[in-house]
């Protein structure tokens, strides 16, 4: 079998074959394609069960998508010498169900990490911080993509999935430099209270396609750099005054609220007033009442206070079964 040496510009990607010799520093691992010119290694859809040990030192972009990795242990990418150039790591759709503490240690340049489409039954609190110290060394991560990482119901741990993800995001305050966080399609019922306070550099936050019913206990106040907040396709019924004021106070933000089942009753009055004067909400004239029945399909922006009533609550003596 011929072994693949470092790729040349004439052959941007070379697939490696098994080699009898010990790996050279810039050799391409078996079942991978490598381009030194592009500083890229692709080990895609190869049913790999572990991270290749013989990754070339030049790798800046590493794609390990569509594999069967199952577990990412501590130091999964630790090498001697370290993979000092690795900046973008894509592990999406690789059947990971466990990411252990310190899995991404010894990657000093890692700016972008994508773990999407892995059913993570266990995500260590120290997956991104690397240590259990109350304040860790800052992570170099700038973009963290965690879309659709919720495991099936039968694989969930006893603790809440929201809590498990939150613990990993806040541990050691390691992610203070994070600019982008994607948490779409994770069946989140709520956003743990303290998460956003620990992510002050966020510019882009995607919480779309979850099951968020309320933002009452979520504070956006310190996200002064936030530019995009995606809340579409949730179960939001109304935004209350505290949330409205916080969003209005963010200097650069654009908020996306499509496809939430807004309840157009007396509790909606403040939100309607705010919508009419804010420039924060994108496509605000698409927001449409879902409930109550008499209000269904009405455009929120066209409502006035007279439309927004609540059925009187009968005193217990007048209630009938």
């Amino acid at each position: 079998t011929s072994s693949a040496s470092s790729s040349s510009s004439s052959a941007p990607f070379l697939a490696s074959a098994a080699s009898a010799q010990p790996p050279l520093p810039d050799q391409c691992p078996a079942l991978c394609e490598c381009s030194e010119a592009a500083r890229t290694v692709k080990c895609v859809n190869r049913n790999l069960t572990e991270v290749p040990t013989d990754l070339p030192l030049y790798v800046r972009n590493l794609f390990l998508t569509g594999n069967q990795l199952a577990v990412l242990p501590a130091g999964a990418f630790a090498r001697r010498p370290p993979l000092a150039e690795l900046a973008a790591l894509n592990l999406s759709g690789s059947r990971l169900d466990e990411v252990r503490g310190g899995a991404f240690e010894h990657l000093p340049s890692l700016r972008q990490l994508d773990l999407s489409h892995n059913p993570l039954a266990y995500l260590s609190p120290f997956a991104f911080s690397g240590s259990n110290a109350s304040i860790s060394a800052p992570s170099p991560l700038v973009e963290l993509i965690l879309n659709h990482i919720v495991p099936p119901d039968d694989k969930r741990q006893n603790r809440s999935f929201e809590g498990m993800v939150a613990a990993a995001l806040v541990a050691g305050r390691a992610l203070q430099g994070l600019h982008l966080l994607e948490l779409a399609s994770n069946h989140f019922l709520y956003l743990p209270r303290d998460v956003l306070a620990q992510l002050p550099s966020l510019r882009y936050l995607d919480l779309s396609n979850n099951s968020l019913v309320s933002l009452t206990y979520v504070s956006f106040r310190n996200l002064t750099h936030l530019e995009s907040l995606h809340l579409e396709d949730n179960a939001l019924k109304v935004l209350h005054n505290g949330t409205l004021a916080e969003l209005q106070g963010l200097p650069h933000v654009r908020v996306f609220l499509d496809n939430n089942p807004w309840v157009c009753d007396c509790h909606m009055a403040d939100m309607v007033t705010w919508l009419k004067q804010t420039g924060v909400v994108q496509g605000k004239d698409r927001l449409t009442c879902a409930f109550p029945e008499k209000m269904r399909n009405r455009v929120l922006l066209e409502l006035n206070s007279a439309d927004l009533d609540c059925d009187p609550i009968l005193p217990p003596s007048l209630q009938t079964s």
Epitope: D233, N259, R286, T288, C289, A290, N297, E302
Partner: antibody
Framework: QVQLQQPGTELVKPGASVKLSCKAS????????MHWVKQRPEQGLEWIGN????????NYNENFKSQATLTVDKSSSTAYMQLSSLTSEDSAVYYC?????????WGQGTTLTVSS | QVVLTQSPAIMSASPGEKVTMTCSAS?????IHWYQQRSGTSPKRWIY???KLTSGVPVRFSGSGSGTSYSLTISSMEAEDAATYYC??????????FGGGTKLEIR
């Protein structure tokens, strides 16, 4: 009661344009988006686009972007759809429908025939 | 864009028979709406938010499902139920899409 009134038929020549109308009554016209849907003979339903009567904002199905133009006249509570450069493929029934999450009221449809 | 696939395309049922038709989504959707269109008439919203019957729809109709799999059931077929039924995904932003329809005939 909510009603959406559409003319029954329109006959036009290939290459010409036509402006279909939909007159709304029984509700506040500006409070609901108005949608247009195409149905060719013995075929399914195809969403063309919608318009917010309050501000004139529109959305279009990519397949109709270059051919359909949606407008409204608030004073008469009427929505319009202009179709240009007509061919025989455009012969169909065109419905207006009030909607948001779903289409809760439909017009009776205008049968457009494109023939020389 | 979500693609909705209805099956069967055509079916027939005898009076009194139980009827079930399905609507399969290419990716998960929160709810599905169903429309009934009798021959020569405009569609009518029949079932909305997966399982709620529009006012005036007989209680022999029901809807169920979640995720990517939805169905409309008639507990006991009647002649007036002969029509084409279309599903549509729950959304308030473009594009709106319909399934290809299931034509239900009386045997």
């Amino acid at each position: 009661q909510v009603q959406l009134q559409q003319p029954g038929t329109e006959l036009v020549k290939p290459g010409a344009s036509v402006k279909l109308s939909c007159k709304a009554s029984g509700y506040t016209f500006t409070s609901y988006w108005m949608h247009w849907v195409k149905q060719r003979p013995e075929q399914g339903l195809e969403w063309i686009g919608n318009i917010n009567p309050s501000n004139g904002n529109t959305n279009y199905n990519e397949n109709f972007k270059s051919q359909a133009t949606l407008t409204v006249d608030k004073s008469s509570s009427t929505a319009y759809m202009q179709l240009s450069s007509l061919t025989s493929e455009d012969s169909a029934v065109y419905y207006c429908a009030r909607g948001g999450w779903d289409f809760d009221y439909w017009g009776q449809g205008t049968t457009l025939t494109v023939s020389s | 864009q979500v693609v909705l696939t209805q099956s069967p395309a055509i079916m027939s049922a005898s009076p009194g028979e139980k009827v079930t038709m399905t609507c399969s989504a290419s990716s998960s959707v929160r709810y599905i709406h169903w429309y009934q269109q009798r021959s020569g008439t405009s569609p009518k919203r029949w079932i909305y938010d997966t399982s709620k019957l529009t006012s005036g729809v007989p209680v022999r109709f029901s809807g169920s499902g979640s995720g990517t799999s939805y169905s409309l059931t008639i507990s006991s077929m009647e002649a007036e139920d002969a029509a084409t039924y279309y599903c549509q995904q729950w959304t308030s932003k473009p594009p709106w899409t319909f399934g290809g329809g299931t034509k239900l005939e009386i045997r």
